[in-house]
Amino acid sequence: LRLLDHRALVCSQPGLNCTVKNSTCLDDSWIHPRNLTPSSPKDLQIQLHFAHTQQGDLFPVAHIEWTLQTDASILYLEGAELSVLQLNTNERLCVRFEFLSKLRHHHRRWRFTFSHFVVDPDQEYEVTVHHLPKPIPDGDPNHQSKNFLVPDCEHARMKVTTPCMSSGSLWDPNITVETLEAHQLRVSFTLWNESTHYQILLTSFPHMENHSCFEHMHHIPAPRPEEFHQRSNVTLTLRNLKGCCRHQVQIQPFFSSCLNDCLRHSATVSCPEMPDTPEPIPDYMPLW
């Protein structure tokens, strides 16, 4: 978790002098509770936006927006703590809006936004806005939270972001898998424009079951420049196991930008259709 272009952070708006500060996620009001505290944020909204860094890289960011309730507690609002928790790593990052002037009611509802938390593809975050000071131990909570899922690199808008492109999102291998005679599979895919090796991972399963009955790995050496964007054809030999008929073919590239952590593409071959009714067994066996 990180912030995008930390230098450009602003929270001031007409009628309010405000500064954005780094936060330890442990506001002073936790340790030294105040008697009078503001009410919670209203209408917390989160959207996925995209922002360029000064270097020109494009990153997905969480656009966080909320409004204030129109009650008298606005007079005791000193700021807000914005917290983003990445659920699979438990990593948390916070910033603090520090109000340098008193808020006053005006003709329209106060609205705040922040769009500088960089988020990763295919990750889930808990986004929380806490009004400051935080409530006394038994006080009503004055925060709002939402669990936000970021699309993966298959998503059309995500595909062109720097983290997705770095993991090979622009490569479309257009995999085709064909079942041949004599327990073989022909796998065909389009090579990318990089002289790097690939790995084909074959996993076979019985019909309707999820534990594998056969696994095989096939190494494809790095193509020469004249082979870039060409089709690569590989024939894989299957183990002759009856019922081991559903095959998942996964292609793992090793691009220089992502090494052994590149996006993998896969294709599946289903078991052949079984006839609904079994063939009738004759009640006599012919002798000829």
């Epitope: 909204q45 936006h49 669990n147 936000f148 699309p151 298959e154 808008r157």
Partner: nanobody
Framework: QVQLVESGGGLVQPGRSLRLSCAAS????????MHWVRQAPGKGLEWVSG????????DYADSVKGRFTISRDNAKNSLYLEMKSLRDEDTALYYC???????????????????WGQGTLVTVSS
Amino acid sequence: QVQLVESGGGLVQPGRSLRLSCAASGFSLDDYAMHWVRQAPGKGLEWVSGISWNGGSLDYADSVKGRFTISRDNAKNSLYLEMKSLRDEDTALYYCAKEKGLGYCRGGSCSSFDYWGQGTLVTVSS
């Protein structure tokens, strides 16, 4: 322009099933999370279910959990709601709604809904 058209509503007996469809046009369906929202007669709007852009994440209101199933077919630009074991209290006008922003939030909307269908009426009565 963006259009959402619901269908599949009707009169059904308690305990029976119904399948609602929502046909989307005017935008790329696989970019956005989609939701079903309902309004019972004389009541306010109630969020029913949501599904992420690729169908990987599904969420339901407690009142329908275990009975309703949301799904989508991006190739057909369609959203569905399979409703089983229907109850009298499921009687409502059912709307499909498009999430305004990109991304998906568990248990409801991340931002707000910027487009709604005209609704399809589901009446559960014996």
